[in-house]
Interface confidence: low
Amino acid sequence: QAGPLPKPTLWAEPGSVISWGNSVTIWCQGTLEAREYRLDKEESPAPWDRQNPLEPKNKARFSIPSMTEDYAGRYRCYYRSPVGWSQPSDPLELVMTGAYSKPTLSALPSPLVTSGKSVTLLCQSRSPMDTFLLIKERAAHPLLHLRSEHGAQQHQAEFPMSPVTSVHGGTYRCFSSHGFSHYLLSHPSDPLELIVSGSLEDPRPSPTRSVSTAAGPEDQPLMPTGSVPHSGLRRHWE
């Protein structure tokens, strides 16, 4: 054997963020020599699953008929060939939404904002939570993650944007979560449409701090400057 077997590719359909009760299929794609595939879930006392490969043997399907809290988490897969086991795949983070009641998303002072001005998106939950996430639809890396300090739970998080440019315009939703599981999120808030008008064009927003090596404005995360400190953790969901 000339070196380790190549690692398989792991992905989820229709995606890795799944609403409670919906079905999801996890795929593991290896090589044509694969004889068996296994799926592991991190920190799970149970093994996850094993499957015989589907013809032509280069991938296997792991089905979750109804998404629940138990299925949320971080997965890796492996395959066995006649010469041994592959390297593990890169991890797949399967997130369930619908674990908690939906928060409310609003814009202060208004969802109608002039380019160059400031706006703050406010995500409020009914019960105290320690993590808030802001999603922008159709962004390449749509997640902004806020975690409160020292695990102190709060009812809201502020996502300031300054200065606002046209790329900030679009549809946003937010989620809330408890720190004990990053993979369980609330129902999404109702959508908020942020409308940017005016001619003070800045081709790229300049956030207070950047944690992204993004290639374009859509990839640039919006950084908080408010009272809830950034955790330094970001997940990129497709």
Partner: antibody, heavy 121, light 107 residues
Amino acid sequence: EVKLLESGGGLVQPGGSLKLSCAASGFDFSRYWMIWVRQAPEKGLEWIGEINPDSSTINYTPSLKDKFIISRDNAKNTLYLQMSKVRSEDTALYYCARPYYRYDVGYFDVWGAGTTVTVSS
Amino acid sequence: DIVMTQAPKVLLVSAGDRVTISCKASQSVSNAVVWYQQKPGQSPKLLIFYASNRYTGVPDRFTGSGYGTDFTFSISTVQAEDLAVYFCQQDYSSPWTFGGGTKLEIK
């Protein structure tokens, strides 16, 4: 408490049929592969076959493939073994067990107490 | 099918003895060997997996080792409750197969 309880064993004539059941409790049955293993009197253990959680994959030991059928009903938390064309060599204690499969590790960590099948005329 | 051959078939022991059981696979099974204990009238109980890993709650007098085709299972200090039949099993290639068993009996 995680438990498996086999039933359905008994005396059966050569060439006859019998259906064994295994009732599972204390764990999420619908998420686990399940297996059947048998042990002839004063003999070793023989793996009969296995079934995956949604019944889409069922594997048998080759010599038993044409006479045994493994199935499951997740709504009833029950595993089944349909035996047909039985012969005296099928006389054994039949166990259902829960396998643990993780990466390149596989073992059977939960076993039932077994049910006895005796093939005799 | 992979054949697992255990030796000896019977082992006569006294309390306090150290015992070793051998299991040979007909082809390489890497580390994928499991050991079970079966006491009279009981179902098998998992002791060792992945050749050398003790299962939860298994006393440390039970150990396993080996790789490829040759595996051993040892009990460092046999106690009365260890009298049982011990089986090896390979989890390398389906169908999963067991050794014929080794019975520990009092001298």
